[in-house]
């Protein structure tokens, strides 16, 4: 099933201590899906969208950037026939970068 779209949403972090907000949206066929956010291949957070919503926003607390590195990806799952979970393709990666200190 098609990959979700992923986007870093404001307010953008300016340091590793700032929270990170990442929106993940499934295509229109799949409202109410279960979403998983990955970083560097490891699960960071899981969220379920309400039944009338197509996406979720992951809110990662400050310091999350110190976790295993690499880009973020998200994925969603839906129940298919025989109540078996079907997983989407992974989203495109999204990288979080911080302004270079000017001192």
């Amino acid at each position: 099933i098609p990959a979700p779209s992923i986007r870093l949403v404001p307010p953008y972090p300016s340091s590793q201590e700032d929270p990170i907000h990442i929106a993940c949206m499934a295509p229109g066929n799949f409202p109410g899906a279960n979403f998983t956010l990955y970083r560097g291949g490891q699960v960071v957070q899981l969220l379920q969208a309400p039944t009338d919503q197509r996406g979720v926003t992951f809110n990662l607390s400050g310091g999350s950037s110190k976790a295993p590195g690499g880009p973020f990806h998200c994925q969603y799952g839906v129940l298919g026939e025989l109540n078996q979970s079907q997983l989407s393709d992974l989203s495109e990666p999204v990288n979080v970068s911080f302004p270079v200190p000017t001192w």
């Epitope: 098609p2 929106a23 949206m25 295509p27 229109g28 066929n29 009338d52 919503q53 197509r54």
Partner: antibody, heavy 116, light 107 residues
Framework: QMQLVQSGAEVKKPGASVKVSCKAS????????FSWVRQAPGLGLEWMGW????????KYEQKFQGRVTLTTDSSTNTAYMELRSLRSDDTAVYYC?????????WGQGTMVTVSS | DIQLTQSPSFLSASVGDRVTITCRAS??????LAWYQQKPGAAPKLLIY???TLQSGVPSRFSGSGSGTEFTLTISSLQPEDFATYYC?????????FGQGTRLEIK
């Protein structure tokens, strides 16, 4: 090339029903939902409802609830919109749209005229 | 239900101008907003989805920004073919409401 081809224009009397078809080609039918949008002459876009080709679930704009039915037929890659109890203010162009991350493929529109 | 308000409703501009259209949502819709262009007698065309992602084949002079409740569509340098009506749409939650439209005309 992804394409949605709708059935032709209709003229109906008040109280009648209309069923508009929308045939999809150029992509896998069951991976994308459909929404239906209408546009009365000179006015804006009005979302009517949504149907999942994955499991058949539907959602309708409240003002159309009970008067509209959306269906799909995956054997012919076709979506349908039936609107009942037509009134003169239902006169509009009706669009089927592929509902993906947004409404990325639109049918050419079907003009439905309701007149006594 | 979520309401979307576009401003301005009507805009007069010249070829080469930079124009901005705003769409405000009555409650937060994350980044789940799309922009469409419609020319007379034609079906709408998707320009931008997820607030800022350019749909394939759309010229780069179109850009979108915003999150939460306030969004903008910017055309950096108007071309003759850009004179049309523009609609925003929220895709966060059902019903999938459209804004009332902004008509962009040649000055």
């Amino acid at each position: 090339q992804m394409q949605l081809v709708q059935s032709g224009a209709e003229v109906k009397k008040p109280g009648a029903s209309v069923k508009v078809s929308c045939k999809a080609s150029g992509y896998t039918f069951t991976t994308h939902a459909f929404s239906w949008v209408r546009q009365a002459p000179g006015l804006g876009l009005e979302w009517m409802g949504w149907i999942s080709t994955y499991n058949g679930n539907t959602k309708y704009e409240q003002k159309f609830q009970g008067r509209v039915t959306l269906t799909t037929d995956s054997s012919t890659n076709t979506a349908y919109m039936e609107l009942r109890s037509l009134r003169s203010d239902d006169t509009a162009v009706y669009y089927c749209v592929r509902d993906s991350r947004a409404f990325d493929v639109w049918g050419q529109g079907t003009m439905v005229t309701v007149s006594s | 239900d979520i309401q979307l308000t576009q401003s301005p409703s009507f805009l007069s501009a010249s070829v080469g101008d930079r124009v901005t259209i705003t769409c405000r949502a009555s409650q937060g819709i994350n980044s789940y907003l799309a922009w469409y262009q419609q020319k007379p007698g034609a079906a709408p065309k998707l320009l931008i989805y997820a607030a800022s992602t350019l749909q394939s084949g759309v010229p780069s002079r179109f850009s979108g920004s915003g999150s939460g409740t306030e969004f903008t569509l910017t055309i950096s340098s108007l071309q003759p073919e850009d004179f049309a009506t523009y609609y925003c749409q929220q895709l966060n939650t059902y019903p999938l409401i459209f804004g009332q439209g902004t008509r962009l005309e040649i000055k």
